[in-house]
């Protein structure tokens, strides 16, 4: 799969492949994988992809199920790239405070916060 | 500050304190702090709080600016707790696939994705 495929298209295709291969993926009834308790998904990317790795190692490969795992590894690559962009640019305090304000504002409005 | 204050109220108060103390915080004109290039904030919590630590070490403490940094450390504690909850519960593959589908769905609709 060319990595040039837009990430948004990659995600859509992966969702479709996930539905297609669901029966095959759940074949192992004894397998247990960590599942986050909350819905702040971005905080859990590491655990999600560890789980995907576990699932891949337990799944019979071949056909489009391979494409599913290839897609998921490209999505991981994209997220790793985004994580790199968290700390690459050193800016003045003013810009950092604008970003911090945005971050707290997002926490305030969009995060799923349990008291 | 009691940690019993609801996190949502804590975030609101912190936003107000950030506005109040802006002038004091930007006093150091040579200080540079990593600022994420994108708006997928949850991916960058580690760098954001490292930046807050840098800022705190360079800011004259006293009065309500101390409360600002105390609040920020409580918010960090909350996020660290959320991160712990990413991997604590081991579930069957079906539950993991439901979560993975939700995660990709959120990526598809809510993440800030550049092609």
């Amino acid at each position: 799969i060319p990595t040039e495929i837009p990430t948004s298209a990659l995600v859509k295709e992966t969702l479709a492949l996930l539905s297609t291969h669901r029966t095959l993926l759940i074949a192992n009834e004894t397998l247990r994988i960590p599942v986050p308790v909350h819905k702040n998904h971005q905080l859990c990317t590491e655990e999600i992809f560890q789980g995907i790795g576990t699932l891949e190692s337990q799944t019979v490969q071949g056909g489009t199920v391979e494409r599913l795992f290839k897609n998921l590894s490209l999505i991981k690559k994209y997220i790793d790239g985004q994580k790199k962009k968290c700390g690459e640019e050193r800016r003045r305090v003013n810009a950092f405070l604008d970003y911090l304000q945005e971050f707290l504002g997002v926490m305030n409005t969009e995060w799923i916060i349990e008291s | 500050i009691p940690t019993e204050i609801p996190t949502s109220a804590l975030v609101k108060e912190t936003l107000a304190l950030l506005s109040t103390h802006r002038t004091l915080l930007i006093a150091n004109e040579t200080l540079r702090i990593p600022v994420p290039v994108h708006k997928n904030h949850q991916l960058c919590t580690e760098e954001i709080f490292q930046g807050i630590g840098t800022l705190e070490s360079q800011t004259v403490q006293g009065g309500t600016v101390e409360r600002l940094f105390k609040n920020l450390s409580l918010i960090k504690k909350y996020i660290d707790g959320q991160k712990k909850k990413c991997g604590e519960e081991r579930r069957r593959v079906n539950a993991f696939l439901d979560y993975l589908q939700e995660f990709l769905g959120v990526m598809n609709t809510e993440w800030i994705i550049e092609s």
């Epitope: 810009a95 970003y99 945005e102 | 290039v37 994108h38 550049e114």
Partner: antibody, heavy 119, light 107 residues
Framework: QVQLVQSGAEVKKPGASVKVSCKAS????????INWVRQAPGQGLEWIGY????????RYNQKFKGRATLTVDKSTSTAYMELSSLRSEDTAVYYC????????????WGQGTLVTVSS | DIQMTQSPSSLSASVGDRVTITCKAS??????LSWIQQKPGKAPKTLIH???RLIDGVPSRFSGSGSGQDFTLTISSLQPEDFATYYC?????????FGQGTKVEIK
Amino acid sequence: QVQLVQSGAEVKKPGASVKVSCKASGYTFTNHHINWVRQAPGQGLEWIGYINPYNDYSRYNQKFKGRATLTVDKSTSTAYMELSSLRSEDTAVYYCARDYGNFWYFDVWGQGTLVTVSS
Amino acid sequence: DIQMTQSPSSLSASVGDRVTITCKASQDINSYLSWIQQKPGKAPKTLIHRADRLIDGVPSRFSGSGSGQDFTLTISSLQPEDFATYYCLQYDDFPYTFGQGTKVEIK
């Protein structure tokens, strides 16, 4: 493709206000800051300020603070720059420009809007 | 505010010439500088960001260098479409500030 399309030319009297619009298309509006820059006839470029459509936060060049107001309408993916108490020296072409990333370079510019202030 | 001093303010050159424009910041701006091209009656267009990174689609004859306070834009072999005014912009600190511009004219 990514585009910023600005409103048409305006002629205003001194003391009046003007509101210039900048309609974004081809990308998710809330992902990028919108900057405003002006250029007086035969002169250089001058930064007015930026607005973050993600949270409506705006920051101004001190020179324009109190006279310029930056706003957005997320439902139409449009940014606005209003300048009040106009004087003849405000005659200029006003540009909107998109930040590539947070506090980053301007990767897309609007075509510009000429504002003429004359009695 | 950070002052950006650009030189020369204008220059005459021929097609094929190598052209260099410099920009000096009044304080350290790291590498947060972009170079912008503007043709008469047209909107500006960013060519280079972060001092030396060429934007996609911009010809490779354009290059940038420098960090801290001193920056340079070079056009290795001037083409007819390159006759324009060039501005540097610092986006390191608020307010963002531009150089006064360098007009590149045909000799």
